[in-house]
Every structure is written in C-alpha cells, then in structure tokens.
C-alpha cells in the first residue's frame, strides 16, 4: 500500500481519519515539512516574550524577548533579566561586581581582572567594576635605555632551577 | 491493545531531579503526539507539555518551562519527562496521555497508568 | 489562557434520573473535550469534540453546547457512572481543564 501522507505537503497534515487526506492545519499549528501525521502548536510569546515572527501554517512563531530582558538558549527558549555594566545576575536579583572582578555586558557573570602580571607585563589603566585593567608594557621595557630589539630571555625546560 | 505503561512511584529530596517513562505498545508511536499532564491529590488535570516523537518537537505550559522536560526515543517507544529543583507542589501523579495528531482536535484518546511523584526530605 | 468553569462541584442523583452539568470558558472555544475519572484510576476518554462519544461509552451520555457554554448529559443515570467528570479546551494555548463535576449515585 503506498503511503499518500508523502504527499503531504508543509501546512498540512495527513489524516489517518480520512483516507490519508491532506488536510490543512488548523489555526494556531503548523508543519513546517510535507508528510506530517500531525501539526504542531504553535509557540506562543507571553509574558517576558514578545513575538517576532508570527506562526504560519508552514512555520513556528519566534519570540524575542522584552526590554530589560534577553535570550538564553536555542531558538530564545528564556528570557533571563538584565543587569547594568558592572553587575551580575544571582538568585537574589542583579548585585555589583565584587572587588578584582568586572562585567562589561548588561547579561553574564562578574570576570576577574587580567592578572598583567603574569604576562610580565604592568597595569597601564586600573580595572573598575565595568572594565577590565588594560596592560602596558613589562616595567623593564619601560627602564631607561631598554632596546626594543633586546633579545627574548632563554626559555628553562621545565622542572629545572635557575642554577 | 494500545497501552501507555508509566514508570514505578518515585520519591525524592527537595532540589533533587526525576525522570520518569511511558512506554507505548499497540500502535505506530510516531503518529501520535505524547502529552504529560499533572494531577495533585484531590485536585484536577494540568496540562506539562507535549513532544510529538517523529520530529521531536515540543510545546510547554510556560508554567513548566522551567520544570519539566520532555524527550522521546521512538527506538524503543518511549516518552520521558525530567522534573528538576523538586518542591513539595511538585508531589502529585502525572500522567502521559496520547492524543491523536491526525484529528487535530487535541483530544487525549488514551492515558497512561500515572506515575507518583512524592517530595520528601 | 482559558478558564473553564464547571457546575455543579458535586452532583448527586438517583439511578435512572436524568442528569446535567456544565461547563462554561471564559472565552469563547472551538469545542469540548470530556474526561471521567474514578477515584484510584487515570482519566479516561469520555467525549470529543462537544458531541462524539469515545469508543464503549454507553449511549446515554450524551454532549452538546458552543462558544463558552458547554454540557454533558445523562438520560438515565446508571450506579457505574460514579466519577468525576472533567472537561477540556484546546482553542488557546495552553491546553486547561475545568476542576470536575463529582457525579454521586445515591
């Protein structure tokens, strides 16, 4: 027996109550491929989303999400709240960044500061609880009589002492 | 026959997840969407959600987005449902619940024997 | 969403009389599911679509309504039809239920 539902194309659906007839979807569905047995719900966009495509009898609806919220996930599944610069969203609401961290977006977490440091390098700017410290050159480069063409220090194999 | 068979009863801690089955027999389970809906003791019938298993598709009561998931391996024509962060109003039974996509009237032809869910610490 | 209303919350009857209830969406719906449920039991299928009655439903069950005014009717009440009786929409997402009409035999 040949399957008509193949037939089907998207905006329908094959109905097994009729002959494998293909019958449109009703209001508020969808298929989005031919050969559906069914369709499906259309996603609906309330409370903290807001729609940015409309459902079609061929596609889903698209959500976004409110002002002072933003998307989280595939296709926007969540809507999580934004915070200000500076700031992280807990449990408790959006708190500051604690000392030695930042956040320059209004969604995520506090980061820590570039350790210049460790890149033997120094810090040029102060970090505050929006930005991230912004490194300069090491303090030897900025020595009186340092060349720019100073060779590169030997690297050690691991595991071995200065002698 | 078609039958819905749901996992044993289940009791868990507060914060604690579960996941529970339906196991479908007697007809082609990829031609139905699977429903899973909530009843407290003494109370009545909350509709979860939905996946429909041929394409994996789902549809949530925005009241449980954050609660259940829902996923389906039609290799062996089962549904499942993961409840996370349990609370004391997560105890209740739920059930799984076929409806037939063809009608497109949304109807729950046929259920599935419950599973309970009771939150304890 | 939806919210169905339904009447009486209990319903007590004699065998053979007839019986109605309610139930009524908040807006209006497209048509009307019917669920019974007895006490230990998962619901079962009772009435689609406002009028179409399940498979091994017996003929004195009967539905009927439109827009947000819904019923379900038995001519003649049998000591069996002890449940409650739950009605369902799906016209606007999400899928609801109304809270039941508890049928009592007396």
């Known amino acids: 027996l040949q399957d008509l539902c193949s037939n089907c194309p998207a905006g329908t659906f094959c109905d097994n109550n009729r002959s494998q007839i293909c019958s449109p979807c009703p209001p508020n569905s969808f298929s989005s491929a031919g050969g559906q047995r069914t369709c499906d719900i259309c996603r609906q966009c309330k409370g903290v989303f807001k729609t940015r495509k409309e459902c079609s009898s061929t596609s889903n609806a698209e959500c976004d999400c409110i002002s002072g919220y933003h998307c989280l996930g595939a296709e926007c599944s969540m809507c999580e709240q934004d915070c200000k610069q500076g700031q992280e969203l807990t449990k408790k609401g959006c708190k500051d960044c604690c000392f030695g961290t930042f956040n320059d977006q209004k969604r995520g977490i506090c980061r820590p500061w570039t350790n210049c440091s460790l890149d033997g390098k120094s810090v040029l700017v102060n970090g505050t609880k929006e930005r991230d410290v912004v490194c300069g050159p090491s303090p030897a480069d900025l020595s009186p009589g340092a060349s720019s063409a100073t060779p590169p220090a030997p690297a050690r194999e691991p595991g071995h002492s200065p002698q | 026959q078609v039958q819905l068979q749901q996992s044993g009863a289940e009791l868990a801690r507060p914060g604690a997840s579960v996941k529970m089955s339906c196991k479908a027999s007697?007809?082609?389970?990829?031609?139905?969407?699977m429903h899973w809906l909530k009843q407290r003791p003494g109370q009545g019938l909350e509709w979860i959600g939905y996946?429909?298993?041929?394409?994996?598709?789902?549809n949530y009561n925005q009241k449980f987005t954050d609660k259940a998931t829902l996923t389906a391996d039609k290799s062996s024509s089962t549904a499942y449902m993961q409840l996370s962060s349990l609370t004391s109003e997560d105890s209740a039974v739920y059930y799984c619940?076929?409806?037939?996509?063809?009608?497109?009237?949304?109807?729950?032809?046929?259920w599935g024997t419950g599973t309970t869910v009771t939150v304890s610490s | 969403q939806i919210v169905l209303s339904q009447s009486p919350t209990i319903l007590s009857a004699s065998p053979g009389e007839k019986v109605t209830m309610t139930c009524r969406a908040s807006?209006?719906?497209?048509?009307i599911h019917w669920y019974q449920q007895k006490p230990g039991s998962s619901p079962k299928a009772w009435i689609s679509?406002?009028?179409n009655l399940a498979s091994g439903v017996p003929a004195r069950f009967s539905g009927s309504g439109s827009g947000t005014s819904y019923s379900l009717t038995i001519s003649r009440v049998e000591a069996e039809d002890a449940a409650t009786y739950y009605c369902?929409?799906?016209?606007?997402?999400?899928?609801?239920f109304g809270s039941g009409t508890k049928l009592e035999i007396k």
């Open positions: 619940a076929r409806s037939d996509g063809s009608s497109s009237k949304w109807y729950f032809d046929v």
């Open positions: 007697g007809y082609t389970f990829t031609f139905y969407t």
């Open positions: 996946i429909n298993p041929s394409s994996g598709y789902t």
């Open positions: 807006s209006s719906v497209s048509y």
């Open positions: 679509a406002t009028s």
């Open positions: 369902q929409q799906w016209s606007s997402n999400p899928f609801t």
